[in-house]
Every structure is written in structure tokens, then in C-alpha cells.
């Protein structure tokens, strides 16, 4: 969590933005918030990003105003307009590129005063694992599938039954580049399951983890899955 | 307890239509994989198809592939086998099964119904 | 298809004796080999997985052992309710999964 605050000149006010990860080819949101003003027309919204020379996105007097945008921008950003007079100035990012990571500030000004916070977004891909028993293999056999993740992650396997047991030497993980070239889908397999247990395929890398978790008895067989976004500092 | 209970068979013409129902209890049917599995007058058993545990997977044999559709609905906890073209070689006792959970082999069958194709 | 080959196609035993009944693939199959049992008019009943794992409630007397494409099915002391139709099934390589033609387990 950045918490920013006005620079002299008016009265400063409390702008804060919450470090996100964007999933690319997906829309992903900036998050910030900052005190409300009652007049709409006097607020003003200004999201630049380090390293770019124009602006991101600007909301002035009730609606975008764009003339300034970056090329690479053109497009893709909204703010949601309706929840900006009660201090909503989150940014609507479509179509997430790889390049869209950096450093991002949301500046703010109202009739109270002026403030800012800075907002660190990265990108990359990540997915919901689903695990199944691969009753095609030679063996007891579960496969774990997760679709799109980047940069290449991790995958660790672990038992409810076996707990604290390395199942590196009893599992494979391969890695295979999906059509649009960045992007992988995670596939790995584990072998010699047994029955009455319950395994998990954790997947990781710097921006998300993912758990996919399979219950295998002989009258039951449940999956569940799911992904948390690692690095979500608000400040 | 688990229990598979199979009905709609009966004595049909050949060329015709005829769909057999699995009702299944006693366990969490939506996890599993289903089968048929028959038996001709006097031989031995023959699989003939299984589907996925959430439908999106099909198999058959060869001698019925084309023919027939097995089908489920999670919802009502029921197997088919829709067997159209039937044919005078399609009369059995048709059995469903339950796939194991981590291997196709057969812990559970129903008691079968048959099935009669003749003129 | 892998081809599952039961031999004998008949056992006559006597009651107390014990039956030995065979199964071979035609390719390997690793340990995924069932063995069940059918009498007249009833459904088949799973007695063996993995090639040698007992299923749920089934007696110590049934046992099977074999690896790769030859299996093996004894039956240490014959119990009248023994005597019924033995059949393999193959669940390594599918589709098809396939079963043995079965061997009937007589009184001598």
C-alpha cells in the first residue's frame, strides 16, 4: 500500500494505490483512491508512467480527455467515471501487455488540494491449475494442467498423507510456448499415487501462485483450485 | 453402499433404436468415470465405451463406434448408452461400471439388463 | 489393442485343492491387471487389482502375482462357492480395455 500525499502549494490530500500484477492479453486494473470531492467537475486525474513521455490517462471535468495519451496507451484505459466523484481513480487497463510493467503514479487533483502515489504493476500470465488422474498412464498417475503462465514458474507437488516428502524424483514437468509466443502452458505429472490421499500442484513464479488440489478416495473424487496474487503492497 | 441399477432393455429389430439407463448411488458420481461393459449369450464380457467424469471425453469400441453414444447427467446422477443401428451381434446383457479412481478396472457393476436385437 | 490370452479355458478341481489360472498380454502391461469373478446370473465381481491387491472383502485364499504380459490367478484351497468363470482385464493401454476369454473353474 502507497499512501501519497499533496506537495505545497494548496492543502494536500491522501492518494493510495495498491501494487498489482496485470495478466496479459487480459484487462487488469490500477488501483487509486484518494478523498472524495463533491463536485466532479473539479477533479482531475492524471496516470503517467515512469519512463513514458505522455500521459497514460487523464479525467478532467467529468470525462477523459485524451489529447496527451501515449501512443502505446490509445485505447485501452478507462477510468470507471461513475465512482470517481466518491474517490474511486482506479485505471482500467486493456488487453495487458508485457510491456505495460513499470512504475505507474496516480495524480490527483481536487478542490481540497493536490496528491499523488505510485503504483509498481507487473505483468506476466498466470492461471488456475486443474488437476485429473491420467488413467492413461502406466501407472497411478495424476497430470496437472494450468494453461498460460510467464515467466516460466516453478511447480511443486505435495501430499496430505506424505507430508514433507520431495516428489521431485517421482514427478515430470514440462513447459510448452502457447501460440502467441510468450506465454506457456504448465504441464506435470505425478506418478505412484496412491489411493486415500490428497495432492497438491503449487505453481509459482514472482507474480502468482496457484494451487490445484485433487482428493482421490474410492467414492470420491474432488478438485479444487486456486491463485493468489503475490506482492499486493498498497501504498 | 455403492449401487448401479440398469434399465430399458428388451427385445428390439434390427436397424432400430434403444437407449439403456445407469442410476447410480452411493457415491460421488460426478467424479468418476463410466462404462459399459456387455456380455453375448454364453461369452465372454466386452467393453464397449467410458465417458470422462465431466462428459468432455468419449470412448468406444470399435464394433459399436458409431453407433452408439453414451452420455450422463451429473445432475441426476445417470449413465446412457443411446445404441442406435442395432444389430443382431449387439445382443447381451449390458452392464454399467464404476472406474476405479485411479485405474480402469471395475470395482462396481450393475446387475445388467439385456438386451435382445431379432426379427 | 492388447490381447488378453486365458489359459485354461476349463479347470476341474477338486473341492480343497488349489487352482491355478493363467492370463497373458499381448504386450507388456506393466501391473494393470484386474481379475474378477462371475457366477451364473450375476454380475462379474472384481477380486484383484494392480496384479496382485486384493480387492474390498475378497479372501485371503485368492492371489495373483505376474508383471509385464504373464499373470497369474491361484486360488490356494477351492471353496464350493469358487467354482464360476474367471476373466482378466488388461486397464494399461485403451481404448479398447480388454478382457481375457475367461476360464471356468469346475468341480472335478
Known amino acids: 500500500l502507497i499512501i501519497g500525499f499533496g506537495i505545497s502549494g494548496r492543502h494536500s490530500i491522501t492518494v493510495t494505490t495498491v501494487a498489482s500484477a496485470g495478466n496479459i492479453g487480459e484487462d487488469g486494473i490500477l488501483s487509486c483512491t484518494f478523498e472524495p470531492d463533491i463536485k466532479l467537475s473539479d477533479i482531475v486525474i492524471q496516470w503517467l508512467k515512469e519512463g513514458v513521455i505522455g500521459l497514460v490517462h487523464e479525467f478532467k471535468e467529468g470525462k477523459d480527455e485524451l489529447s496527451e495519451q501515449d501512443e502505446m496507451f490509445r485505447g485501452r484505459t478507462a477510468v470507471f467515471a461513475d465512482q470517481v466523484i466518491v474517490g474511486n481513480a482506479s485505471l482500467r487497463l486493456k488487453n495487458v501487455q508485457l510491456t505495460d510493467a513499470g512504475t505507474y503514479k496516480c495524480y490527483i487533483i481536487t478542490s481540497k488540494g493536490k496528491g499523488n502515489a505510485n503504483l509498481e504493476y507487473k505483468t506476466g500470465a498466470f492461471s488456475m491449475p486443474e488437476v485429473n488422474v491420467d488413467y492413461n498412464a502406466s501407472s497411478e498417475t495424476l497430470r496437472c494442467e494450468a494453461p498460460r503462465w510467464f515467466p516460466q514458474p516453478t511447480v511443486v507437488w505435495a501430499s496430505q498423507v506424505d507430508q514433507g516428502a520431495n516428489f521431485s524424483e517421482v514427478s515430470n514437468t514440462s513447459f510448452e510456448l502457447n501460440s502467441e509466443n510468450v506465454t506457456m502452458k504448465v504441464v506435470s505429472v505425478l506418478y505412484n499415487v496412491t489411493i486415500n490421499n490428497t495432492y497438491s500442484c503449487m505453481i509459482e513464479n514472482d507474480i502468482a501462485k496457484a494451487t490445484g488440489d485433487i482428493k482421490v478416495t474410492e467414492s470420491e473424487i474432488k478438485r479444487r483450485s486456486h491463485l493468489q496474487l503475490l506482492n499486493s503492497k498498497a501504498s | 453402499q455403492v449401487q448401479l441399477v440398469e434399465s430399458g432393455g428388451g427385445v428390439v429389430q434390427p436397424g432400430r433404436s434403444l437407449r439403456l439407463s445407469c442410476a447410480a448411488s452411493g457415491f460421488t458420481f460426478r467424479s468418476f468415470g463410466m462404462h459399459w461393459v456387455r456380455q453375448a449369450p454364453g461369452k465372454g464380457l466386452e467393453w464397449v465405451a467410458v465417458?470422462?467424469?465431466?462428459?468432455?471425453?468419449?470412448y468406444y469400441a470399435d464394433s459399436v463406434k458409431g453407433r452408439f453414444i453414451i452420455s450422463r447427467d451429473n445432475s441426476k446422477d445417470t449413465l446412457y448408452l443411446q445404441m442406435n443401428s442395432l444389430r443382431a451381434g449387439d445382443t447381451a446383457v449390458y452392464y454399467c461400471?464404476?472406474?476405479?479412481?485411479?485405474?480402469?478396472?471395475?470395482?462396481?457393476w450393475g446387475q445388467g439388463t439385456l438386451v435382445t436385437v431379432s426379427s | 489393442e492388447i490381447v488378453m490370452t486365458q489359459s485354461p479355458a476349463t479347470l476341474s478341481v477338486s473341492p480343497g485343492e488349489r487352482a491355478t489360472l493363467s492370463c497373458r498380454a499381448s504386450q507388456s502391461i506393466s501391473s494393470n491387471l484386474g481379475w474378477y469373478q462371475q457366477k451364473p446370473g450375476q454380475a462379474p465381481r472384481l477380486l484383484i487389482y494392480?496384479?496382485?491387491t486384493r480387492a474390498t472383502g475378497i479372501p485371503a485364499r485368492f492371489s495373483g502375482s505376474g508383471s509385464g504380459t504373464e499373470f497369474t490367478l491361484t486360488i490356494s484351497s477351492l471353496q464350493s462357492e469358487d467354482f464360476a468363470v474367471y476373466y482378466c482385464q488388461q486397464y494399461r493401454s485403451w481404448p479398447p480395455l480388454t478382457f481375457g476369454g475367461g476360464t471356468k473353474v469346475e468341480i472335478k
Open positions: 494392480g496384479a496382485s
Open positions: 465417458i470422462s467424469y465431466d462428459a468432455s471425453n468419449e
Open positions: 461400471a464404476k472406474g476405479g479412481a485411479l485405474r480402469w478396472y471395475f470395482a462396481y
